[in-house]
Amino acid sequence: FVRTKIDTTENLLNTEVHSSPAQRWSMQVPPEVSAEAGDAAVLPCTFTHPHRHYDGPLTAIWRAGEPYAGPQVFRCAAARGSELCQTALSLHGRFRLLGNPRRNDLSLRVERLALADDRRYFCRVEFAGDVHDRYESRHGVRLHVTAAPRIVNISVLPSPAHAFRALCTAEGEPPPALAWSGPALGNSLAAVRSPREGHGHLVTAELPALTHDGRYTCTAANSLGRSEASVYLFRFHGASG
């Protein structure tokens, strides 16, 4: 018998064809994969299916964010009898199929990782031709992207009453700890806002009152490294009289 589950938007969620306990749809993905920004990652995905010796047309798909409805980041199609899955979509040219779908392997290589790639990915296979069937991983694999700190912005801004304040924003994973140093400061963890709303890898530290002229340095550090940047404050002191 065939059991098909449909969600409210009429997307086919999965189809389980029950012929024998050993022959049913399943997908094997690890819960999480970790890799460093700038490097490559492999998202493993293998599957079993009930259609023995299927060699008809197939499509392999990876999507990001959420299953069934998330945006596709990779898609390839293999013609009947072909071992070659021809890539039809590779977002930013960074997604490459490592596995052979004919051998039940949809594993994907992601190149030049960025912190924005840190999300969940879902593999899916679709059979067409004599057999029409499809299956998608429900839970997916979380890609955890780590990164050494990088200071993305450092600035001095005016404050009320002719005062000045300094802001330092850094990104990294784990989110970096920020410290300010400067004239009459020593080391200060002044007013860290961590992390910013909607920007999970960004951390901002504020120095609310710059009391002396000179160089102010922001240092960002996490387990993968450290980064620093400086701003200079020189106020114009006019002659009194």
């Epitope: 490559a40 990652a41 998202l43 040219g93």
Partner: antibody
Framework: EVQLVESGGGLVQPGGSLRLSCAAS????????MNWVRQAPGKGLEWVAQ??????????FYAASVKGRFTISRDNAKNSLYLQMNSLRAEDTAVYYC????????????WGQGTLVTVSS | DIVLTQSPDSLAVSLGERATINCRAS??????????IHWYQQKPGQPPKLLIY???NLASGIPARFSGSGSGTDFTLTISSLQAEDVATYYC?????????FGQGTKVEIK
């Protein structure tokens, strides 16, 4: 049957230029990444350059030893791969192989017979 | 760049005996169980031929006496029963990180 046939090799003086070609047949050229790999006389193999296909925006990659001097390109309509070599040096003397790789793997599943480039005065 | 070091540089093996070639990478070439090491055979005056891809997968048309194993930084190509036509130089290659690099080669001869 997959075939890769290189041409354009020869003797050139240091500082000179040469353009290598590779004619591909027996497969859908558009589906694959293409590479140049070289082998100096009596030495080992050195990957030189790669050009990806349309889906991968024809991205190009180069070995540090040739970057800025060599340019890889392809003409899908002609099923051809090219290597423009400028500012040639004695150490560029080698047999240059055209090699195919799948979009999913940077290994070389088919190779041409090679064309010899000799840089000498 | 990832440096691949093959050992030995040359190897003499009797016909029918086992030949083993090692390839060591200067850093890990394995990600999530996938090892980006490939093996080639090159006979004199010929281009290289792919034998094994991703550490252990036999390329199309290659006899089953060739096998590959390993992960991380250490990999092995084994010829289970050396034949006369296996006399050649063997190279490993990595595609873990660009630039793709090759080992220096191992020459296999008949003892």
């Amino acid at each position: 049957e997959v075939q890769l046939v290189e041409s354009g090799g020869g003797l050139v003086q240091p500082g000179g230029s040469l353009r290598l070609s590779c004619a591909a047949s027996g497969f859908n050229f558009n589906d694959y990444f293409m590479n140049w790999v070289r082998q100096a006389p009596g030495k080992g193999l050195e990957w030189v350059a790669q050009i990806r296909n349309k889906i991968y925006t024809y991205a190009t990659f180069y070995a540090a030893s040739v970057k800025g001097r060599f340019t890889i390109s392809r003409d899908n309509a002609k099923n051809s791969l090219y290597l423009q070599m400028n500012s040639l040096r004695a150490e560029d003397t080698a047999v240059y192989y055209c090699a195919r790789s799948l979009t999913g793997g940077d290994y070389f599943d088919y190779w041409g017979q090679g064309t010899l480039v000799t840089v000498s005065s | 760049d990832i440096v691949l070091t093959q050992s030995p540089d040359s190897l003499a093996v009797s016909l029918g005996e086992r030949a083993t070639i090692n390839c060591r990478a200067s850093q890990s070439v394995t990600i999530s169980g996938y090892s980006f090491i490939h093996w080639y055979q090159q006979k004199p005056g010929q281009p290289p031929k792919l034998l094994i891809y991703r550490a252990s997968n036999l390329a199309s048309g290659i006899p089953a006496r060739f096998s590959g194993s390993g992960s991380g930084t250490d990999f092995t190509l084994t010829i289970s029963s050396l034949q006369a036509e296996d006399v050649a130089t063997y190279y490993c290659q990595q595609s873990r990180k660009s630039p793709w690099t090759f080992g220096q080669g191992t020459k296999v001869e008949i003892k």
